[in-house]
């Protein structure tokens, strides 16, 4: 369970892949599409508001009562819209929603090598946001083999301005 209804911190950042392609968001036919693309030099990177929450592990392996906490994140590129996992379609979508946000909007943050991060679905452990055919998709990761899979690694670049939502 999320231990608090308020995030412990928020940051405004641009999101890019391990291979330095930008994650961009475009309004098309009254819905948002998510793209993974090489940005032209003069084009500004899209901003994402990342809100970080603490969450206790759901159950204990050892039964000793202290199970550690996870860092959860929600990602919002524009006001009232959040990235959400669609586990049935194995897709990542932008949906307009009100708080409290659904579980599909929460991702467990993993730090990775090369100072990248990965986003694991709260609703489907072992499934991560990844890059597939120039789009974001949900990718099942075999923990024993693919912990460093480049297609689930992302870089966050801080945008130093006030953490107000960008409209």
């Amino acid at each position: 369970s999320i231990t608090g209804i308020s995030p412990i911190t928020e940051s405004l950042a641009s999101l890019s892949t391990y291979n330095d392609q930008s994650i961009t968001f475009a309004l098309e036919d009254e819905s948002y599409e998510i793209y993974v693309e090489d940005l032209k030099k003069d084009k500004k990177k899209d901003k994402v508001l990342l809100s970080y929450y603490e969450s206790q592990h759901p159950s204990s392996e050892s039964g000793d009562g202290v199970d550690g906490k996870m860092l959860m994140v929600t990602l919002s590129p524009t006001k009232d819209f959040w990235l959400q996992a669609n586990n049935k379609e194995h897709s990542v979508e932008l949906h307009k929603c009100e708080k409290p946000l659904p579980d599909q909007a929460f991702f467990v943050l993993h730090n990775r090598s090369f100072n990248c991060v990965s986003f694991e679905c709260k609703t489907d452990p072992g499934v991560f946001i990844g890059v597939k055919d120039n789009h974001l998709a949900l990718i099942k990761v075999d923990y024993s083999e693919n912990l460093g899979s480049e297609n689930i690694l992302f870089k966050l670049s801080e945008i130093l301005e006030h953490h107000h939502h960008h409209h």
Epitope: T9, S62, D64, G68, L71, L109, N115, L147
Partner: antibody
């Protein structure tokens, strides 16, 4: 009670080797990313190495890369630091420390052992 | 590597004083900064994480603020047990790096 207990510190000659151990209790060790941090006499804290909960990912400070190896045995709730090619600059109190978050180092280190002393001198 | 610079390196203060320690990162680290207290012969103790979150069990006289590159630890009213060395630590990226420490001494 959440606890980390280090052992293995000793007086060692330059060029020698030591293996430090850290035994954990009171929390789910296999979920927790762990670290070694040292403090040399009269100096500040220096992060030495880190390892993910599964042991699949390891990280090192440049000052120890190629000489030190971090590892863990989750069945024994124990963290290790194998230290080779020791020099006087490695003289320090060595602490093991648990990451606050199970999958992220963003939260700092919330549980620390009491430390074990390594002295490298001829 | 990210360099962390603390100031002052030492400070003398009296019980009841308000004390502020600053920490500057050589590049932006979002809010991923932790503060520790260490007393002689003891292990470091986590006080603040994520720049401003108070670790469980730590007295509320300790507070943290800042984001990006500039951070502050404030002790609102010094108590006798607060005299120690304080370290900042960037938790944004490996290698993890600490500030050089600030020694808080009794005036």
């Amino acid at each position: 009670e959440v606890q980390l207990v280090e052992s293995g510190g000793n007086l060692e000659q330059p060029g020698g080797s030591l293996r430090l151990s850290c035994t954990a209790s009171g929390f789910t060790f296999s979920r927790s990313a762990m670290n070694w941090v040292r403090r040399a006499p009269g100096k500040g804290l220096e992060w030495v190495s880190g390892i993910s909960g599964s042991g699949g990912r390891t990280y090192y400070a440049d000052s120890v890369k190629g000489r030190f190896t971090i590892s863990r045995d989750n069945s024994k709730n124990t963290l290790y630091l194998q230290m080779n090619s020791l020099s006087a600059e490695d003289t320090a109190a060595y602490y093991c420390a648990k990451d606050s978050y199970t999958t992220s180092w963003y939260g700092g280190m919330d549980v620390w052992g009491h430390g074990t002393t390594v002295t490298v001198s001829s | 590597d990210i360099q962390m610079t603390q100031s002052p390196s030492s400070v003398s203060a009296s019980v009841g004083d308000r004390v502020t320690i600053t920490c500057r990162a050589s590049q932006g680290i979002f809010s991923w900064l932790a503060w520790y207290q260490q007393k002689p012969g003891k292990a470091p103790k986590l006080l603040i994480y994520a720049a401003s979150s108070l670790q469980s069990g730590v007295p509320s006289r300790f507070s943290g603020s800042g984001s990006g590159t500039d951070f502050t630890l404030t002790i609102s009213s010094l108590q006798p047990e607060d005299f120690a060395i304080y370290y900042c630590q960037q938790a944004n990226s490996v290698p993890i790096t600490f500030g050089q420490g600030t020694r808080l001494e009794i005036k």
